[in-house]
Interface confidence: low
């Protein structure tokens, strides 16, 4: 496993946001911007890949506009001057709705995917290696911005999935400290570890053509449901699991289970028929006491996309939905490394899983 220096994600950064891309853009780098379009009066937002923080040199300006029926502008700015616009007269975003926006940097272009579907490609007008900053502004709320390194090694498929290992390098965990990066929670800086981006097979027995390219950057069918995969190394303090998907319009329930052998260490069970998010643990086929309290209204909505971020801490799991902290679930099964299986089932379509 070749661990290379993917940077830690920016968690729930305030907008407008500007952040460094460590090492700059590289061929094969995948950057995921996950957030929600505000339903307020603002009609635009933008993601910029630029040199420095001034905004005078923007290699790629990605600018959805909720105007004139909705369209997306792509452009480049050099020395303060904009070039000719490239317009896509289809609007894949909706006001008030969450989104998963992925940018794949390739030698000739940027490929942009919205909610798992290839949306546009933008050919480089300036050398992309000059880019060292990502900025986001406008009518949007961010859940996270994550980075997946280009150098990947395919690993053996677990069940029907084709995971690609994506190395992520965090600072060593300071003994006895939990530091607070910008974000939802004070996520533990993790030891060097690996993250796996899961994709599905495009046809039985056939993987996507080039394993060296982050697979999420290609259109793919829905994940098979139920979706089951191994969590390499199991849980440990600072381990994150990210899932995004769409709730089916007629959904009754779905579940996300973190399992240890025959036990379900963590059962996350949104129930639309009860307007509840139920959490529980099952040990030896016996359920414990349910936890249902929420700090706000049910965050999952039929027919809408969502992201779930599960952060393992020493004493609990912290769960955020669409970038907002929802609840903590104190470990009932404390043997964290044995919690090494993720199971997702029910009335959703998955678009992205990162363990």
């Amino acid at each position: 496993m070749a661990f290379s220096g993917s940077q830690a994600p920016y968690l729930s950064p305030a907008v407008p946001f500007s952040g460094t891309i460590q090492g700059g853009l590289q061929d094969g780098l995948q950057i995921t911007v996950n957030g929600t379009v505000l339903s307020s009066s603002g009609t635009r937002f933008a993601v910029n890949f630029q040199t420095g923080f001034s905004g005078n040199d923007i290699a790629f300006h990605f600018n959805p506009r909720f105007e004139d029926g909705g369209y997306v502008v792509c452009n480049t700015r050099q020395n303060g001057s904009w070039g000719p616009e490239e317009r896509k007269t289809h609007m894949p975003f909706q006001k008030g709705m969450p989104f998963d926006l992925c940018f794949l940097v390739q030698s000739s272009d940027f490929k942009v995917m919205v909610n798992g579907i290839l949306f546009v490609q933008y050919f480089h007008r300036v050398p992309f290696h000059r880019v060292d900053t990502i900025s986001v502004n406008g009518s949007v709320q961010l859940s996270y911005i994550s980075f997946q390194n280009p150098r990947t090694v395919p690993v053996q498929p677990a069940f029907s999935t084709v995971p690609f290992s994506q190395p992520v390098c965090f600072p060593p965990r300071p003994r006895g400290r939990r530091q607070k990066p910008p974000g939802v929670w004070p996520a533990n800086p993790a030891p060097i570890t690996q993250t796996v981006i899961h994709t599905v097979q495009s046809a039985p027995g056939q993987m996507f053509s080039t394993p060296a390219i982050p697979p999420m950057m290609y259109p793919h069918p829905a994940y098979p449901m139920p979706f089951i995969t191994t969590i390499l190394g199991g849980l440990y303090p600072s381990k994150s699991i990210l899932l995004s998907g769409t709730v089916l319009p007629s959904a009754q329930r779905f579940h996300i289970n973190l399992c240890s052998g025959n036990h379900i260490a963590f059962h996350l069970n949104p129930r639309f028929d009860e307007n509840a998010v139920v959490r529980n643990t099952q040990i030896d086929n016996s359920w414990g006491s349910e936890e249902r309290s929420l700090p706000r209204k049910m965050p999952f909505v039929r027919g809408q996309s969502f992201s779930v971020w599960i952060l393992c801490e020493a004493h609990c799991l912290k769960v955020a939905v669409d970038g907002q902290h929802l609840f903590e679930y104190y470990h009932r099964l404390r043997n964290l490394p044995t919690i090494n299986r993720l199971e997702v089932g029910g009335d959703i379509q998955l678009t992205h899983v990162q363990t």
Epitope: R175, G176, R177, R178, K180, W185, P186, N188, Y236, P237, A314, H315, C316, K318, H325, E328, Y329, Y330, H331, R332, L333, R334, N335, L336, P337, T338
Partner: antibody, heavy 117, light 107 residues
Framework: EVQLVESGGGLVQPGGSLRLSCAAS????????IHWVRQAPGKGLEWVAA????????DYADSVKGRFTISADTSKNTAYLQMNSLRAEDTAVYYC??????????WGQGTLVTVSS | DIQMTQSPSSLSASVGDRVTITCRAS??????VAWYQQKPGKAPKLLIY???SLYSGVPSRFSGSRSGTDFTLTISSLQPEDFATYYC?????????FGQGTKVEIK
């Protein structure tokens, strides 16, 4: 019935060492964290150290870091606190406590450590 | 380290009184705060966890609440057995910290 029983306390000279034990029973030891919390005479509670026995993660208060070592033997359902380079200010009743998924829900009766010449 | 500043350090009250003890965290600790009761010569006992959840077997006159980084333990009607010292404790940071304690005495 859940029980935690501390032992190993006593009188020790400054600079000396002691090892405290916390024998657990009545629950699956490997599913819980064990904490040591101390209380100096007439003072409040001070968290000392914790071990997450399933993972081996340990954490220490700054005041004891480098001098105290927490460990656990899951086969014996016992946690330990090895205390070296003891100082007068380490004099206290030392409690071990189990941290479940809701907090430190069970505590031992405590063992007194006196550091004095 | 996260500091938990508890107040008052002591209070005098009568049986039947409503008693409120507060704890302020020096930074956000989410809802990862517990409250303990300790009587002289005894180990602490868990009363409240996750800021507002009542521990099993604890009388319902005890309650906890959170407002940002301020946490409150309330005893709605003080009983004779409630005269003790109360501590808050955060478990948000890996370095757990306790408040300095509030001694509830008989007036």
């Amino acid at each position: 019935e859940v029980q935690l029983v501390e032992s190993g306390g006593g009188l020790v000279q400054p600079g000396g060492s002691l090892r405290l034990s916390c024998a657990a029973s009545g629950f699956t030891f490997s599913r819980y964290a064990i904490h040591w919390v101390r209380q100096a005479p007439g003072k409040g509670l001070e968290w000392v150290a914790a071990i997450y026995s399933p993972t081996g993660y340990t954490d220490y208060a700054d005041s004891v870091k480098g001098r105290f070592t927490i460990s656990a033997d899951t086969s014996k359902n016992t946690a330990y606190l090895q205390m070296n380079s003891l100082r007068a200010e380490d004099t206290a009743v030392y409690y071990c406590a189990r941290e479940g998924y809701i907090g430190m829900d069970y505590w031992g009766q405590g063992t007194l450590v006196t550091v004095s010449s | 380290d996260i500091q938990m500043t508890q107040s008052p350090s002591s209070l005098s009250a009568s049986v039947g009184d409503r008693v409120t003890i507060t704890c302020r965290a020096s930074q956000s600790v989410s809802s990862a705060v517990a409250w303990y009761q300790q009587k002289p010569g005894k180990a602490p006992k868990l009363l409240i966890y996750s800021a507002s959840s009542l521990y099993s077997g604890v009388p319902s006159r005890f309650s906890g609440s959170r407002s940002g980084t301020d946490f409150t333990l309330t005893i709605s009607s003080l009983q004779p057995e409630d005269f003790a010292t109360y501590y808050c404790q955060q478990s948000y940071s890996a370095l757990y910290t306790f408040g300095q304690g509030t001694k509830v005495e008989i007036k």
